[in-house]
Each structure stands twice: as structure tokens, then as C-alpha cells.
């Protein structure tokens, strides 16, 4: 009996036309939501004038439906048993699942000012930028609507730069009508233990953002894993959101709508400094902000963001070193709310429920030549927002899963 089940599973998890896996893989049957909490700065003037701690108050959730679009340009390659695709991006605001509207205002760091002062270290250039910042009446902080902050706005300061620069700024700009990829993944036809594992991303096996093994594209995209998952496994996956591969380890058995699943979590060790976890040495890209690679819990992804000083962390700086959160007041990290987990059905390797949590931060540094940053006495990794992307298998699908997979085994 078990062999027959194994044979059936192996057949059905292959990523090709006609299998259960393929149908759900092309277009997820699960409703996926992305909730945002924005960090509203309460004391912008005090920070700018006196280099005070930044007082933030999170406001949210503001919820969007995401991942509702089918994969595009799905192309099988029989020669190397891979399938390539683009993952289109789309977000639809869900007012009924939100605390306000997309027109709600927030006081946040001025993204353009922080980024320009970081990208252009040249003092002559900073003096030119300072003039443009002053002319445009820009400051260290700005008031922006949710829609502007997430999806983009025309920045008044950048609009004055007399050179070809992108004048539209937004944390996720551009998003709608764009796609992530091309991904090329193994379809599992020749070797089921490789199914869904990424072969190449954007035509390459490496990212070109990191040194050594940190630059590798490992595992799947976390939507599924090769079947027959063991609790002892370390599940590798690649997340383009954080510009790196990461891993999850088994935490507990969970019953999800009558389906036994394994809960895998991202461990704190994955965010540790190289002092604690030597494997992470290549995620430390500079010595000053990282305090000689002793800081932990924040990832400098500037190389992946055209030099903009974007730092990724867990929400509320969960698992981050005290020096990172010290200049920020109003954060309350807790594991239950702020960690990332994947609930994986072990026989098929399908992720039936997940919560992906991350925080977007921007580095702002003192600048002698830029007036609005002149009074800063220290560097700040400023939290802008955190997000919770979740998906849970629907009741109908769960019933189907129970009857066709887990029910047959039990």
C-alpha cells in the first residue's frame, strides 16, 4: 500500500500539465494577503534638530490581496527537466480587512533624502543635493499617504535633479504590472527529490549581491518542497524580497484543518552575527554600521536595491542586537507575532499555511553638507513598515487534501 501511495505522490507532485501540483502551482488556490503596519514617526523635529531617539507608533493592518495572478510564460524544457516562469505582481487593497484607507497619512523618513545622501558621498555632490533639498522644501521626514509610500510618488527633491534620475519613489515601486523572475525550477520528472528546486533565477545560479556561499540560490521558493519531508531536514528556500536564500527548521507538529503538518520556522541563528554563526560572515558587507560585523538581525540589501540603503529585518527588530533598536522607541518584538513560519504537509511537501514577516528599514546617516541631516549625531536604521504575508489552504481544498492524500495514508 505504502509503495503505491509513494508512487502516486511522486507522480502527482511533478510540475507538469495534468498533475494536482501543477494546477495549484500555476495559480495558487489559496488566498494570500499581505498586511502592512506603518511606523508613524511621532517626533520628527526633535530627531532632526537634536538627534533624539525616533519615537514610532505602528498603524495597521492595511491589507492587500496578493499572488492572485497565474504564473506567466510557463515553459517546460524536456531536455533538462525544468520549467521556467514569471511570477506576476499584483496587489488589491482590501478595505474590510484594513484599519483605514490608502489615503491615510503617515510621517515617515524622507526616502529620497536618506538614499541620495548615502549614494552620493562626494561632498561637492552633497552640496548640490543640499541646495535642491532646500529648494524643494524637503526635510529629513515627510508626510505621505499609504498609497504613495507603498506604490510610489513623484519626489519634489529628485524632480529638481538636472540629471536622468528616477523621480518616482516608493517602497514597492514599481509593483503592479511587473513580474518577479524568470525562475527556472526542476519539474521533478527525472528526480522527484529535486522538484520545485530553483535551477536559475534571472538566468543565473548566483545573485551577484553577496560573497561566497551567501550568493547562492538555494532550495525552492517556499511554496512547496520536494515530497516526504523529514523533521530533521533544514528546508532551504530563496526569497527575492530579501535578496537571499534562507532556511527553516522544524519546530512542532500542527493540525491544520484536520491535516497533520510540520511547522518549520526561521530560527534566530539565521539572523545571527558571524560571531555567533560563522556561516553568516558573507552577509556582513560593511564594517561601520555593523560595528565590525558584531551587530545582528538586520540585513543590508543595498547592493540589491541600486545602492539605496535598505535594511531588512524581522518586525520590531525581533532577533536583532540591542544597538540596532536602541535609537528607536516604541518597538515591542515578540516571536508569536513577528517570526516567519511555514506549515508543510510532509507527504507532498506542499506549504499549506504560511506567515512571512519582514520589516523594511532605511539607513540615515549624519551629513555635514546636507542641512536637514547636519544635526544628527549617530546613524539610524529607521523602520518604515513591517508586513505579514499569509496564506492558508481553503476548506474545500483541505477536504480534498484529506480525502485524497492524508486520509489514504491513515
Amino acid at each position: 500500500g505504502d509503495l503505491l501511495i509513494q508512487k502516486t505522490i511522486k507522480k502527482q507532485v511533478v510540475l507538469e500539465e495534468g498533475t494536482i501540483a501543477f494546477k495549484n502551482w500555476v495559480k495558487t488556490g489559496t488566498e494570500v494577503y499581505r498586511q502592512f503596519w506603518i511606523f508613524d514617526v511621532q517626533n520628527p523635529q526633535e530627531v532632526m534638530m537634536n538627534s533624539s531617539n525616533i519615537q514610532v507608533k505602528q498603524r495597521g493592518p492595511y491589507t492587500y490581496r496578493v499572488r492572485f495572478l497565474a504564473k506567466e510564460n510557463v515553459t517546460q524544457d524536456a531536455e533538462d527537466n525544468t520549467v521556467s516562469f514569471l511570477q506576476p505582481n499584483g496587489a488589491i487593497f482590501e478595505p474590510s480587512l484594513s484599519v483605514g484607507t490608502e489615503a491615510d497619512n503617515f510621517t515617515v523618513l524622507n526616502l529620497a533624502v536618506a538614499a541620495a545622501s548615502h549614494i552620493y558621498q562626494n561632498q561637492f555632490v552633497q552640496m548640490i543635493l543640499n541646495s535642491l533639498i532646500n529648494k524643494s522644501k524637503s526635510s529629513m521626514f515627510q508626510v505621505r499617504t499609504l498609497r504613495e509610500l507603498l506604490w510610489g510618488y513623484r519626489d519634489p527633491f529628485l524632480s529638481l535633479v538636472p540629471y536622468p534620475v528616477t523621480t518616482t519613489v516608493g517602497l514597492f515601486y514599481p509593483y503592479n504590472n511587473t513580474a518577479d523572475g524568470v525562475y527556472k525550477v526542476f519539474n521533478g520528472k527525472d528526480n522527484i527529490s529535486k522538484v520545485a528546486i530553483i535551477d536559475t533565477y534571472k538566468g543565473k545560479r548566483n545573485l551577484s549581491y553577496w560573497e561566497s556561499h551567501c550568493d547562492m540560490i538555494n532550495g525552492t521558493d517556499a511554496a512547496s518542497f520536494p515530497p516526504f519531508v523529514e523533521k530533521s531536514q533544514v528546508l532551504q528556500f530563496f526569497s527575492s524580497d530579501i535578496c537571499r536564500s534562507i532556511y527553516a527548521v522544524f519546530e512542532s507538529d500542527v493540525n491544520l484543518k484536520g491535516i497533520p503538518v510540520y511547522r518549520f520556522v526561521l530560527p534566530s541563528k539565521a539572523f545571527a552575527s558571524p560571531v555567533e554563526n560563522p556561516d553568516n560572515y558573507c552577509f556582513c558587507t560593511e564594517k561601520i554600521i555593523s560595528k565590525n560585523c558584531t551587530s545582528y538581525g538586520v540585513l543590508d540589501i543595498s547592493k540589491c536595491k541600486e545602492g539605496r540603503p535598505v535594511y531588512i529585518s524581522l518586525p520590531h527588530f525581533l532577533y536583532a542586537s540591542p544597538d540596532v533598536s536602541e535609537p528607536i522607541d516604541g518597538l515591542n518584538p515578540n516571536e508569536e507575532e513577528h517570526r516567519t513560519y511555514l506549515d508543510i504537509e510532509p507527504i507532498t511537501g506542499f506549504t499549506l499555511q504560511f506567515a512571512k514577516r519582514l520589516q523594511v528599514n532605511l539607513l540615515v546617516k549624519p551629513s555635514e553638507k546636507i542641512q536637514v541631516l547636519k544635526n544628527l549625531k549617530r546613524n539610524y536604521i529607521v523602520p518604515i513598515l513591517w508586513l505579514n504575508e499569509t496564506g492558508t489552504i481553503g476548506d474545500e481544498k483541505a477536504n480534498m487534501f484529506r480525502s485524497q492524500v492524508t486520509g489514504k495514508i491513515n
Epitope: Y120, N122, Q123, F124, V125, M127, N130, S131, K135, K369
Partner: antibody, heavy 118, light 104 residues
Framework: AVTLDESGGGLQTPGRALSLVCKAS????????MFWVRQAPGKGLEWVAG????????LYGAAVKGRATISRDNGQSTVRLQLNNLRAEDTGTYYC???????????WGHGTEVIVSS | ALTQPSSVSANPGETVKITCSGG???YGWYQQKSPGSAPVTVI????KRPSDIPSRFSGSASGSTATFTITGVQAEDEAVYYC???????????FGAGTTLTVL
């Protein structure tokens, strides 16, 4: 030693264009912002134009804005000043200068004289 | 523009101070011994001195005012001294009108 050699000066006709070239040596040219400064006969120094180390950012003095273009070739270690629609008041000695990093000059060329006259 | 005195005079061996104000940033001081001869940088970035410039030349800055000092002035120091810097109101690099130093 740091040397900056200007060329391209001489007698010019009003309304015409002028191209001055500064050839740099003795330092890593691509690491420095470069400026042009001029001095009219019997007058003080006047800042004309500046360009950052990789040529992305340029800035011009009020008297030449809209008529001047500063450019650089880091491979050749040269900086060029193109001045269009020449006027009599553009007459003077034009100096190439190296920025020490904070709009503060630490080296000068010997200068090239420009006379705009009909 | 930057403001500096039009002239100062001193006896050999005396200390001369020239001030410059109105700039937003680092100042430089430039010596020109005769009109048409190339300027020579004596101080850049407020207080830095090129290696070939004698130690009697020094500079300092506080706020938007820079001070250039010659301690023990010599006859060969007779020249026009220009200060240069950044003018925030004008948004560009500027020079002062020059200070003529006469050594009596």
C-alpha cells in the same frame, strides 16, 4: 607632482564657441572633482564650473549658466569646458583646478588666456 | 558672495589675520602674487596646508566665518589673498573679492 595643463585659449570672436581642455597628471584623476575658475583683467577670481569625480554631476556659475558645458574623460585624465555664444566679458585667464573634496581647491593650473574681441 | 577686507598691512615679523564670512562650508585661501599669475593654494578645507607651504600660514573656521593667519609675516608674502567656499544662498562655489596684503 600634481600638474594641470590648460590649452585652447587665444583670440575668439563674439558669438562663437570655445573649447578649453585641461590635461591632468601626477594623481588619480578619477578620484577628484574638477573646476574651472577664471579671472578677468584687473578683477578677482570667479568660479565658472565644476564636475564631480565620475562626471554625473555638474554645476555652473551664474555668468555662464546655459552657455557652458563641463565634461571629463577619466581614461584620458582630461576635463573640458565648452563655452558657447562668447561675450566680451568672457575675456580673462581660465584656470583648471582640483577640488580637495569639499569645494576647496588644492591645486591650480597655470592658466590659459582667452580674449573675446571682434 | 564671501566677504573679506579689501586690504591689510603689517610689518615684517608681525601676525596678520584675514577673515572671510558668508560661506556655508569649508573655506580655502589662495595667494596670487601678481595679476595673471596662477593662484597658489595656501590653505584648503579650512585648516589644511599643502606640503610645500610654510608653517607660518594657518587657517581656522568657526560657524560661517573663516580666519586666515600668517604668523611672522615676510616680505615675500605680499600678495592678494582670496578666500573661496560655498555660498548656500547662491548655490555655488564663490570667491571673496580678495584682500591685498602689504608688507611695510
Amino acid at each position: 607632482a600634481v600638474t594641470l595643463d590648460e590649452s585652447g585659449g587665444g583670440l575668439q570672436t563674439p558669438g562663437r564657441a570655445l573649447s578649453l581642455v585641461c590635461k591632468a597628471s601626477g594623481f588619480t584623476f578619477s578620484s577628484y572633482n574638477m573646476f574651472w575658475v577664471r579671472q578677468a583683467p584687473g578683477k578677482g577670481l570667479e568660479w565658472v564650473a565644476g564636475i564631480d569625480d565620475d562626471g554625473s554631476f555638474t554645476l555652473y556659475g551664474a555668468a555662464v549658466k546655459g552657455r557652458a558645458t563641463i565634461s571629463r574623460d577619466n581614461g584620458q585624465s582630461t576635463v573640458r569646458l565648452q563655452l558657447n555664444n562668447l561675450r566680451a566679458e568672457d575675456t580673462g585667464t581660465y584656470y583648471c583646478a582640483r577640488d580637495s573634496g569639499a569645494v576647496s581647491i588644492d591645486a591650480w593650473g597655470h592658466g590659459t588666456e582667452v580674449i573675446v574681441s571682434s | 558672495a564671501l566677504t573679506q577686507p579689501s586690504s591689510v598691512s603689517a610689518n615684517p615679523g608681525e601676525t596678520v589675520k584675514i577673515t572671510c564670512s558668508g560661506g556655508d562650508s569649508d573655506y580655502g585661501w589662495y595667494q596670487q602674487k601678481s595679476p595673471g599669475s596662477a593662484p597658489v593654494t595656501v590653505i584648503y578645507q579650512n585648516d589644511k596646508r599643502p606640503s610645500d607651504i610654510p608653517s607660518r600660514f594657518s587657517g581656522s573656521a568657526s560657524g560661517s566665518t573663516a580666519t586666515f593667519t600668517i604668523t611672522g609675516v615676510q616680505a615675500e608674502d605680499e600678495a592678494v589673498y582670496y578666500c573661496g567656499g560655498w555660498d548656500g544662498s547662491y548655490d555655488g562655489a564663490v570667491f571673496g573679492a580678495g584682500t591685498t596684503l602689504t608688507v611695510l
